[in-house]
């Protein structure tokens, strides 16, 4: 059965937008005016995983690209990457765990927890123009709260 998806953009709680930085990396920075067109549009798919009232498992693909955010171990550390997939097979309802994030809604803000690595979250730095990464702490210097903006298909 086809997987349900929606198109959206994400901004961190400091209102930084996410843009491509090279072919396989995202960075976060403040955008204004026409520069807003640079921000990446995600195709957020609703997939297999732990589901409750405030937690929904999703996969985050880049719209019209065969790239998905995924979580893997690099040098023994959970790491966020953009992974290329076969567009004939993705998205699917039952995605591999490394592609799955628990979208957690708390006080109108969203967190994205890795299903592969519990308590690791999609994060941005306080500093401008830095890579989006997988962070193992909440409530510290790094930012783990996001807002989502719907984009028409």
């Amino acid at each position: 059965a086809p997987v349900r998806s929606l198109n959206c953009t994400l901004r961190d709680s400091q209102q930084k937008s996410l843009v491509m930085s090279g072919p396989y990396e995202l960075k976060a920075l403040h955008l204004q005016g026409q520069d807003m067109e640079q921000q990446v549009v995600f195709s957020m798919s609703f997939v297999q995983g732990e589901e409750s009232n405030d937690k929904i498992p999703v996969a985050l693909g880049l719209k019209e690209k065969n790239l998905y955010l995924s979580c893997v171990l690099k040098d023994d550390k959970p790491t966020l990457q953009l992974e290329s997939v076969d567009p004939k097979n993705y998205p699917k309802k039952k995605m591999e765990k490394r592609f799955v994030f628990n979208k957690i809604e708390i006080n109108n803000k969203l967190e994205f927890e890795s299903a592969q690595f519990p308590n690791w979250y999609i994060s941005t730095s306080q500093a401008e123009n830095m890579p989006v990464f997988l962070g193992g702490t909440k409530g510290g210097q790094d930012i783990t709260d996001f807002t989502m903006q719907f984009v028409s298909s």
Epitope: A1, Q48, K94
Partner: antibody, heavy 119, light 106 residues
């Protein structure tokens, strides 16, 4: 409390078509996937296929050419059809619900229907 | 077709810990589920999403999944835990059960 009640012919001849129906009582019908699983006597479980409320299906590749799963949302029922049966299709057939709260796996099962294929 | 391999049988003394394994290619990158089936009954879900317990399932049941192996662990095994246990996962667009393990409580 969710209940799945299934019925259908229990004795078939080779080459006939197996038909089973499962009725769902309690809970929403549209929020779940609905599956069929079978278990030959003394053997393990085999997943047959699934359907959602819109009629979208996935099937086990080994059975795909003979299987049809359909849904009747007005009655909260779904059905299994397996054509050209042989003795190898003798099994207990179960219907089950796949729920988002359990990670889209089978959390409620019917009581099972023994289907015997014999000439 | 994808294969999930389980030992046909596992024996354990009452009060001891039973471990039932399920092996499959890159199984740790998928979600694993476990069912208990007693003779003449429908299967019952005991572990979902690798390590979560449905309500009503005792705490002695736990699960893990990494690499190529998922494991169901029953600590303080009781006589009533004697049953067949099946692992379950997905392969692309379809679902696969392991061959089943008969747990005997000696």
């Amino acid at each position: 409390q969710v209940q799945l009640q299934q019925w259908g012919a229990g004795l078939l001849k080779p080459s006939e078509t197996l038909s089973l129906t499962c009725a769902v009582y309690g809970g929403s019908f549209s929020d779940y996937y609905w599956s069929w699983i079978r278990q030959p006597p003394g053997k393990g479980l085999e997943w047959i296929g699934e359907i959602d409320h819109s009629g979208s299906t996935n099937y086990n590749p080994s059975l795909k050419s003979r299987v049809t799963i359909s849904v009747d949302t007005s009655r909260n029922q779904f059905s299994l059809s397996l054509s050209s049966v042989t003795a190898a299709d003798t099994a207990v057939y179960y219907c089950a619900r796949a729920s988002p709260s359990s990670g889209w796996t089978l959390d409620y099962w019917g009581q099972g229907t023994l289907v015997t294929v014999s000439s | 077709q994808s294969v999930l391999t389980q030992p046909p049988s596992v024996s354990v003394s009452p009060g001891q810990t039973a471990s039932i394994t399920c092996s499959g290619d890159k199984l740790g990158d998928k979600f694993a589920f476990w069912y208990q089936q007693k003779p003449g009954q429908s299967p019952v879900l005991v572990i979902y999403l690798d390590n979560k317990r449905p309500s009503g399932i005792p705490e002695r049941f736990s699960g893990s999944n990494s690499g190529n192996t998922a494991t169901l662990t029953i600590s303080g095994t009781q006589a009533l835990d004697e049953a067949d246990y099946y692992c379950y996962a997905w392969a692309d667009t379809y679902e696969v059960f392991g061959g089943g393990t008969k747990l005997t409580v000696l």
